[in-house]
Interface confidence: low
């Protein structure tokens, strides 16, 4: 037989089919040009010597073959001896290792059989009522076609689909959407209305991901206030990646989980912005503000659900940071500057109040004093911690008001509101024998001590009514007992208590007269 | 109609090997996973693992890691499961289940092979 | 791995009657729930995956609900055929595990 016909003769090898798993499959045949055909396959398994025969089969019943050699791809002309008018059925045999392995058969007419291409160049995917719809342009001169696809999640294998006939210059498919797996999709496309014709390659994958993109399972850790007032947010934990399914392995573009963290900052209500979206990969720095932190994950199919967290505020407070003049035209702080043109959000709430009941005012941008210091003042009329009762003041500054993670944290500390040194004056002062010359002074504590930091001592004064002699006694503001020791029996005294703080001396509270009884013996 | 149909009953010793055979029917074997299921006398249902008729692919749960292996032969549309270095605590029934087309979740499971390990 | 608990562990009924069992998973595992049927010296029946889909050929008197964590199996108008051993199972996360099983009586 000529190399270029089909040879109407046994082929050189035993006719048995092995059932292997490896062998040819894929057959694929079509006219190339006015008269020329091809035919090609692909083989599966090892392929060292290996010889592939085309076999073709006429209406008649008679049989021939082609010997392709090694190679998976083979051209003939109408010339060949294989009808190309009529149907013939098609199937390759490669002999290897002593056994003879078939490809599945396809029949066709192989003068109307074209060789279509699977959808190329870019395929859109959009979502759809629930479904997936992907759409693609019609490769040229192929219009009316029949597609396929197939589609694959990480855990499942390809299943198989149809997206009906199409009839235009451009194609498109409904195809189902997972909920919470990602896909890989393959089409493919043939002829449409001709008996038999052969399926085009399948296209490059697409990859979808899942309708809903996963839930960012994420863990934050927030790093101590630093010097510089601000502490860092840091992600203990990354977000889990999405599985893909094999053919969308490395790069996928389509399956992309995108995460942005959203901050709001809750304290500073008064500040112009409250909340700012950034990308998951850069983790900010804060004050010690508190925050609530949002995780958004989204894909192209739009947004997921979130995760959110609340950052409690930094409480350490510090001890002296803060001076506050009180005048007869109203209130002044002073605290140190943090530098040229800064912005500062004072914040106060009463003690042991929810946070929501903060109250702030926002300073103009100031420079520092000639000592350094920042300012804020207000009349008594503004009201502003104008109550007798413990406040929690916290200081923030920024260069850039507008931006929310240039905030930081000044300070934080306790202030005893309205007239602290009379509010603060120690009530039901009482005196008992202790011994012979000496008493004990007891007191209820200050109103002053329920604001930490605030109260710097007590201070008791005894007053000797016979001689004027007067003498005092300071007393931790931890404790409201001391014992007078010294005094002399049959002497009238006075006791007084007051509260001080660090830039106010308290009021005294109402005089105590005591004497120690002569004792009479025997 | 799909059908399962595993191997017959084994009695095997401590320290053996015992390999169930799970031949599938009535529809295309290499499209749809195996998984394998077992079920200790009076006992609830443990996970085992799957096998990808398609490609061979495995996943095993962490507790069989190292003692089970999953094959399978497509030309007869068999699938195997072999449990090795058996303990007394492996006297179970051993069931094949096919996982649907489209989700994870299975349909058709096998009948059943009985694996008693004695001495 | 996730835990799966089912109540009651086992349920007493009459034939007509309608029953619930519940399934509870240890963390959140969407609907990726499925519920089993196992009749004394058989290999288990699917009944409902997703958590509510009916498996082909299931009669519609079984009927799944529930997403997330808690989830319930109704039976309707009981049959002497479905009294047997009910498992549920969670097929979100490796490894994918079954609850304990809840063995349905003849009163």
């Known amino acids: 037989c000529r190399t270029s016909e089909c040879c109407f003769q046994d082929p050189p090898y035993p006719d048995a089919d092995s059932g292997s798993a490896s062998g040819p499959r894929d057959l694929r045949c079509y006219r190339i040009s006015s008269d020329r055909y091809e035919c090609s396959w692909q083989y599966e398994g090892p392929t060292a010597g290996v010889s592939h025969f085309l076999r073709c089969c006429l209406s008649s019943g008679r049989c021939c073959y082609f010997a392709a050699g090694s190679a998976t791809r083979l051209q003939f002309s109408d010339q060949a001896g294989v009808s190309v008018l009529y149907t013939v059925t098609l199937w390759v045999e490669s002999w290897a290792r002593n056994q003879t392995e078939k490809s599945p058969e396809v029949t066709l007419q192989l003068y109307n059989s074209v060789k279509y291409e699977p959808p190329l160049g870019d395929i859109k995917v959009s979502k759809l009522a629930g479904q997936l719809r992907m759409e693609w342009e019609t490769p040229d001169n192929q219009v009316g076609a029949e597609v396929q696809f197939r589609h694959r999640t990480p855990s499942s294998p390809w299943k198989l689909g149809d997206c009906g006939p199409q009839d235009d210059d451009t194609e498109s498919c409904l195809c189902p959407l997972e909920m919470n797996v990602a896909q890989e999709f393959q089409l493919r496309r043939r002829q449409l209305g001709s008996q038999g014709s052969s399926w085009s390659k399948w296209s490059s994958p697409v990859c979808v991901p899942p309708e809903n993109p996963p839930q960012p399972q994420v863990r934050f850790s927030v790093e101590q206030l630093g010097q510089d007032g601000r502490r860092r947010l840091t992600l203990k934990e990354q977000p889990t990646q999405l599985e893909l399914p094999e053919g969308c392995q490395g790069l996928a573009p389509g399956t992309e989980v995108t995460y942005r963290l959203q901050l709001h900052m809750l304290s500073c209500p008064c500040k112009a912005k409250a909340t700012r979206t950034l990308h998951l990969g850069k983790m900010p720095y804060l004050s010690g503000a508190a925050y609530n932190v949002a995780v958004i994950s989204s894909n192209q199919f739009g947004p997921g659900l979130n995760q959110t967290w609340h950052i409690p505020a930094d409480t350490h407070t510090e001890p002296v940071a803060l001076n506050i003049s009180v005048g007869t035209n109203g209130t002044t702080m002073y605290w140190p500057a943090r530098a040229q043109s800064m912005t500062y959000c004072i914040e106060w709430q009463p003690v042991g109040q929810d946070g929501g009941l903060a109250t702030c005012s926002l300073t103009a941008p100031q420079d520092p004093d000639p000592a350094g210091m920042a300012t804020y003042s207000w009349s008594r009329e503004s009201g502003a911690m104008g109550q007798e009762k413990c406040y929690y003041i916290t200081i923030f500054a920024s260069a850039h008001p507008e931006k929310l993670t240039l905030w930081s944290t000044v300070l934080s500390t306790y202030h005893f509101g309205g007239n602290a040194s009379a509010a603060g004056t120690p009530h039901h002062v009482s005196v008992k024998n202790h011994s012979l010359d000496s008493v004990s002074v007891d007191w209820a504590p200050s109103l002053l001590s329920t604001c930490p930091g605030v109260l710097k001592e007590y201070v008791v004064r005894c007053r000797d009514e016979d001689s004027k002699q007067v003498s005092e006694h300071p007393v931790q503001p931890t404790e409201t007992q001391v014992t007078l020791s010294g005094l002399r029996a049959g002497v009238a005294y006075t006791v007084q208590v007051r509260a001080d703080t660090a830039w106010l001396r308290g009021v005294w509270s109402q005089p105590q007269r005591f004497s120690i009884e002569v004792q009479v013996s025997d | 109609q799909v059908q399962l149909v595993q191997s017959g009953a084994e009695v095997k010793k401590p320290g053996a090997s015992a390999k169930v055979s799970c031949k599938a029917s009535g529809y295309t074997f290499t499209d749809y996973y195996l998984h394998w299921v077992r079920q200790a006398p009076g006992q609830g249902l443990e996970w085992m693992g799957w096998i990808n008729p398609n490609n061979g692919g495995t996943h095993y749960a962490q507790k069989f890691q190292g003692r089970v292996t999953m094959t399978r032969d497509t030309s007869i549309s068999t699938a195997y499961m072999e449990l090795s270095r058996l303990r007394s605590d492996d006297t179970a029934v051993y069931y094949c289940a096919r996982e649907m087309g489209g989700t994870t979740a299975f349909d058709y499971w096998g009948q059943g092979t009985l694996v008693t390990v004695s001495s | 791995d996730i835990q799966m608990t089912q109540s009651p562990s086992s349920l007493s009924a009459s034939v007509g009657d309608r029953v619930t069992i519940t399934c509870r998973a240890s963390?959140?595992?969407?609907?990726?729930l499925a519920w089993f049927q196992q009749r004394p010296g058989k290999a288990p029946k699917s009944l409902i995956y997703?958590?509510?889909s009916l498996q082909s050929g299931v009669p519609s008197k079984f009927s799944g609900s529930g997403s997330g964590t808690d989830f319930t199996l109704t039976i309707s108008s009981l049959q002497p055929a479905d009294f047997a051993i009910y498992y549920c199972?969670?097929?979100?996360?490796?490894?994918?595990?079954f609850g304990p099983g809840t063995r349905l009586e003849i009163k």
């Open positions: 199972q969670q097929y979100n996360i490796y490894p994918y595990t």
């Open positions: 997703a958590a509510s």
């Open positions: 963390q959140g595992i969407g609907n990726y």
